[in-house]
Interface confidence: medium
């Protein structure tokens, strides 16, 4: 679990001729706000696919009214961070979509209207817990400057927020009646101690004794602004949070990317993201071939290798479009029977069945179990016009009337002895082994090579298998 954070520093007309004077034009007063959408992975998914990692809207900005004949001012922006909580692991690679919307405040039939001013899409790699990354993007005639980061929350740590740690003061096991949760590290690792005097505001460290500076700061302790003028006019997070994230003239100023490419700053250089059909350091090369990997979502590219030869993408099931960029609506074929609800999960179709029906496509009528009895606590499971019983532990056969020996399959490894038990089986492990099925060797010092024994159990103790 964690939070993706986005800070918009500025949004306004980009450099060069033809820049718009106002976001509101002749429509009357308006106010700006931003929407961020996160999708996992680096694939170019269909635009309408959901923001699977999450989405967030900013607050509405102040009302803006165009002043005739006045120079185009900085546009008033909403305050604060945009925060997108994520529930599961941070994927590391993701697509970031930032949209700038304007809300038209004049009278509208059917309520307020929003119109999209600009949309930028970046495919990025980002580890959780790292410093702020900064970017400058152009969308049409508009320029957007922003910073972003991912950070873990609650007890999560690590670059994907998947390792859980327990505060030193917390109890070391789960409460009564509870199974151990996801594996917790016994103690939270302390963050590394940075070099003495390293700026808390502008420096950080990943190894003990080092002092690495956020962009815009320099010096052995990150206390010297990289450029004394670089933060003038910066609208964004305070230097207490991020240092100076958008210094003055940078590699992307003047946009070195041709043919509508968008520019991202990298340490000491820049990177162009090119529109489809162009590639090269500055998007200066046209004529896409299969060598450029134009087919997304696992599509197979067929075509000549020379620049004059067109290519064709053969799309895998579930995708379509000239570049396999669109997801097929497989539910339109209505695969779920008996009124089931179809869900396209991407990797598979799932049918949610109405009461009384079951099966992958809701094809089975559960009435087959009517009047059928399964003995000894078994439950009836419908199966294509017949029924079968799912038996409780210790019983088997068509109607669960036969006793089954849970030890018959020799479940205890490494010479452990199996005992039948009313709720399953118990393994008594041979010396040197532990675990519910004696599967883990014990080191000579008494520490297991794999998961530790639950509290209260010593290596070699019988352990009940639940």
């Amino acid at each position: 679990a964690g939070v993706f954070e986005l800070q918009i520093h500025s949004f306004g007309p980009g450099p060069g001729p033809g820049a718009p004077r106002s976001p509101c034009s002749a429509r009357g007063p308006c106010r700006l706000f931003f929407r961020v959408c996160l999708k996992p992975g680096l694939s170019e998914e269909a635009a309408e696919s959901p923001c699977a990692l999450g989405a967030a809207l900013s607050a509405r900005g102040p009302v803006y009214t165009e002043q005739p004949e006045a120079p185009a001012p900085d546009l008033p922006l909403p305050n604060g961070l945009l925060q997108v909580p994520f529930r599961d692991a941070w994927p590391g690679t993701f697509s970031l979509i930032i949209e700038t919307w304007r809300e038209e405040l004049g009278d509208q039939i059917g309520g307020p209207a929003w119109s999209l001013l600009a949309r930028v899409t970046r495919r990025r790699r980002l580890a959780a817990g790292g410093p702020w990354a900064r970017d400058i993007q152009r969308a049409g005639a508009w320029e957007l400057r922003f910073s972003y980061r991912a950070r873990c929350e609650l007890l999560a740590v690590g670059t994907a927020c998947t390792r859980l740690c327990r505060p030193r003061s917390a109890p070391s096991r789960c409460g009564p009646g509870l199974r151990p949760c996801a594996p917790l590290e016994d103690e939270c690792e302390a963050p590394p101690v940075c070099r003495a005097g390293c700026s808390l505001e502008h420096g950080f460290c990943e190894q003990p004794g080092e002092c690495r500076c956020l962009e815009g700061w320099t010096g052995p302790l990150c206390t010297v602004p990289a450029s004394t003028s670089s933060c003038l006019g910066l609208r964004g997070p305070s230097s207490a949070t991020t240092g100076c994230l958008v210094p003055g003239p940078g590699p992307c100023d003047g946009n070195p990317c041709a043919n509508g490419g968008s520019c991202s700053e990298t340490p000491g250089s820049f990177e162009c993201t090119c529109p489809r059909g162009f590639y090269g350091l500055r998007c200066e090369v046209s004529g896409v071939t299969c060598a450029d990997g134009p087919c997304f979502n696992g599509g197979l590219c067929v075509g000549g290798a020379d620049p004059d030869s067109a290519y064709i993408c053969h799309c895998p099931p579930g995708f379509q479009g000239s570049n396999c960029e669109k997801r097929v609506d497989r539910c339109s074929l209505q695969p779920c029977r008996n009124g089931g609800l179809c869900l396209d999960l991407g990797h598979a179709l799932r049918c949610r069945c109405r009461a009384g029906f079951a099966g992958p496509r809701c094809e089975h009528n559960l009435d087959d179990c009517a009047g059928r009895a399964c003995a000894n606590g078994g439950t009836c499971v419908e199966g294509g016009g017949a029924h079968r019983c799912s038996c409780a532990l210790g019983f088997g056969g068509r109607d669960c009337r036969e006793r089954a020996d849970p030890c018959a399959a020799r479940p205890c490894a490494h010479g452990g002895r199996c005992y039948a038990h009313f709720s399953g089986l118990v393994c008594a492990c041979a010396p040197g082994y532990m675990g519910s099925r004696c599967e883990f060797p014990v080191h000579p010092d008494g520490v297991s090579a794999l998961p530790a024994a639950p509290p209260g159990l010593r290596p070699g103790d019988p352990q009940r298998y639940l």
Epitope: R35, A47, E48, S58
Partner: nanobody, 129 residues
């Protein structure tokens, strides 16, 4: 998927009050907006009130401004519609919806159904004179 379950509908005399609730479950972090729409037989579904569940900005149809209040409890993933000074013309099936601006469009109306991908089953509100 996002699942929405409405409650709180019923019958009331004109001038009375009702409070509708809508509980959301599932991938609620994928949606930006939740709201209430209503529909009477033979007519199109119309927006009543919507709320940006992130920062709390609200939108109301002109016909309910000053009488209805939409609110949300993010911790419970629930939105509410407090309906006061009810009129017979408020009689309708009220639907809870969740969604937001699509990532493939350039225009959106917070009080119109397009863009709301997830809908509840509806709860009936009847106001008698």
């Amino acid at each position: 998927q996002v699942h929405l379950v409405e409650s709180g509908g019923g019958s009331v005399q004109a001038g009375g009050s009702l409070r509708l609730s809508c509980a959301a479950s599932g991938y609620t972090y994928r949606v930006n907006f939740m709201g209430w729409f209503r529909q009477t037989p033979g007519k199109e579904r119309e927006g009543v009130a919507t709320i940006d569940s992130g920062v709390g900005t609200t939108y109301y149809a002109d016909s309910v401004k000053g009488r209805f209040t939409i609110s949300h409890n993010n911790a419970k993933n629930t939105i509410y519609l407090q309906m006061n000074s009810l009129k017979p013309e408020d009689t309708a099936m009220y639907y809870c919806a969740a969604g937001g601006p699509p990532t493939d469009g350039d225009r959106w109306y917070p009080l119109r159904p397009p863009g709301y991908n997830y809908w509840g089953q509806g709860t009936q509100v009847t106001v008698s004179s």
